[in-house]
Interface confidence: medium
């Protein structure tokens, strides 16, 4: 054998953000001819020796970190990247607003603000069509998302979620959508 067994990929379909009681499928994908897959939920004793886990109705207890690996002969692969499966709709939706407003000139600045009645300390902002959170993939400790030097690429529909660092995989319902409209043409860089 010339190298370690490459790590498989683990994905959630249709998304890793799953509303409570909605279905989701976790799929572990390794090279062809794998002998055995192991898919497990971290920090629990829950695992299965299959590549696909179908969850017909998302529950709070199923939210968390998952990863998978596979076995060929007596060798185990390196583990997949961890997948964070988030249950949404656990708490009431926050409100999302734009300051100074949802219509902004190209080259201007705008701040998207996520507000909640609860004492949540973390917030995530998503732009429709983008699988990853907007801007910085780390957690945010402020409810404000400044967008400096807006371009046409920033226009679109945004939603935010709020949650607590004590239960990082139990999120609110998404805010109502906010349509960010960018007017004018992009400034030519000097």
């Amino acid at each position: 054998q010339s190298g370690p067994l490459p790590k498989p990929s683990l994905q959630a379909l249709p998304s890793s953000l799953v509303p409570l009681e909605k279905p989701v499928t976790l799929r572990c994908q390794g090279p062809p001819g794998v002998d055995l897959y192991r898919l497990e939920k971290l920090s629990s004793s829950r695992y299965q020796d299959q590549a696909v886990l179908f969850i017909p109705a998302m529950k709070r207890s199923l939210a968390g970190r998952y990863r998978c690996s596979y076995q060929n002969g007596s060798l185990w692969s390196l583990p997949s990247d961890q997948l964070e499966l988030v249950a949404t709709g656990v708490f009431a939706k926050p409100s999302l607003s734009a300051q100074p407003g949802p219509a902004v000139s190209s080259g201007g600045d705008v701040t998207l603000q996520c507000q909640t009645r609860y004492g949540f300390d973390q917030f995530a902002l998503y732009k429709e069509g983008d699988p990853a959170p907007y801007k910085n993939p780390e957690r945010w400790y402020r409810a404000s998302f400044p967008i400096i030097t807006v371009t046409a690429a920033h226009s679109g529909t945004y939603r935010c979620y709020s949650f607590s660092s004590r239960d990082p995989y139990l999120w609110s319902a998404p805010s109502d959508p906010l349509e960010l409209v960018v007017t004018g043409t992009d400034p030519i860089p000097e």
Epitope: L42, S43, S45, S69, P79, D81, E84, A132, P137, E138
Partner: antibody
């Protein structure tokens, strides 16, 4: 082939910040995570934190408040920043690839002293 | 956080002999343990991951076993080049190293 190379300041004054860069080759930072590990003089290895391929981060709980890990995928560089240094932060700092850290750099020595 | 208790902290053995190092986790780590060899002036080298899977190029003199909270690592037919410090690492939940075992040859 897979390589990781750390570069740091060598000497840092107490209460100042430490910045170290890990430059990688032979693999993509979008597909693999990078860890930071340190070894104080005559002590064992200590895991500091990790940045995953998707950019999310994990930190050792005792250092979380003063540690930040970021990266530039296009430059194949990962950055460690640690604030409020004390002499206890004197160590050799290593970057290592993914889980369970199959490739390591040679490390860069950091001394915290006035 | 998961703690890893590694023992012994040092040991001495003869060329051709066998040594065993143990690591005990503070909770079940589901076989997610790796073993490293660390020599002065170099970065550590991964020998074994997922309890017992040898990295390519690592001699079969090195082996690992265990489950739940208890794990062990052995070197048989000890060679002079095996002089190093050995560490266990759990990667079930975040990452934690054991305290290390310094191996010397008699």
């Amino acid at each position: 082939q897979v390589q990781l190379q750390e570069s740091g300041p060598g000497l840092v004054a107490p209460s100042q910040s430490l910045s170290i860069t890990c430059t990688v080759s032979g693999f993509s930072l979008t597909g693999y995570g990078v860890n930071w590990v340190r070894q104080p003089p005559s002590r064992g290895l200590e895991w500091l934190g990790m940045i995953w391929g998707d950019g999310s981060t994990d930190y050792q709980s005792t250092l979380k408040s003063r540690l930040s890990i970021s990266k530039d995928n296009s430059k194949s560089q990962v950055f460690l920043k640690m604030n409020s240094l004390t002499t206890d932060d004197t160590a050799r700092y290593y970057c290592a690839r993914d889980l369970p850290m199959d490739y390591w750099g040679q490390g860069t020595s950091v001394t915290v002293s006035s | 956080d998961i703690q890893m208790t590694q023992s012994p902290s040092s040991l001495s053995a003869s060329v051709g002999g066998r040594v065993t190092i143990t690591c005990k986790a503070s909770q079940d780590i589901n076989k997610y343990i790796a073993w490293y060899q660390h020599k002065p002036g170099k970065g550590p080298s991964l020998l074994i991951h997922y309890t017992s899977t040898l990295q390519p190029g690592v001699p079969s003199r090195f082996s690992g076993s265990g489950s739940g909270r208890d794990y062990s690592f052995s070197i048989s037919n000890l060679q002079p080049e095996d002089i190093a410090t050995y560490y266990c690492l759990q990667y079930a939940l975040l990452l934690t190293f054991g305290g290390g075992t310094k191996l010397e040859i008699k």
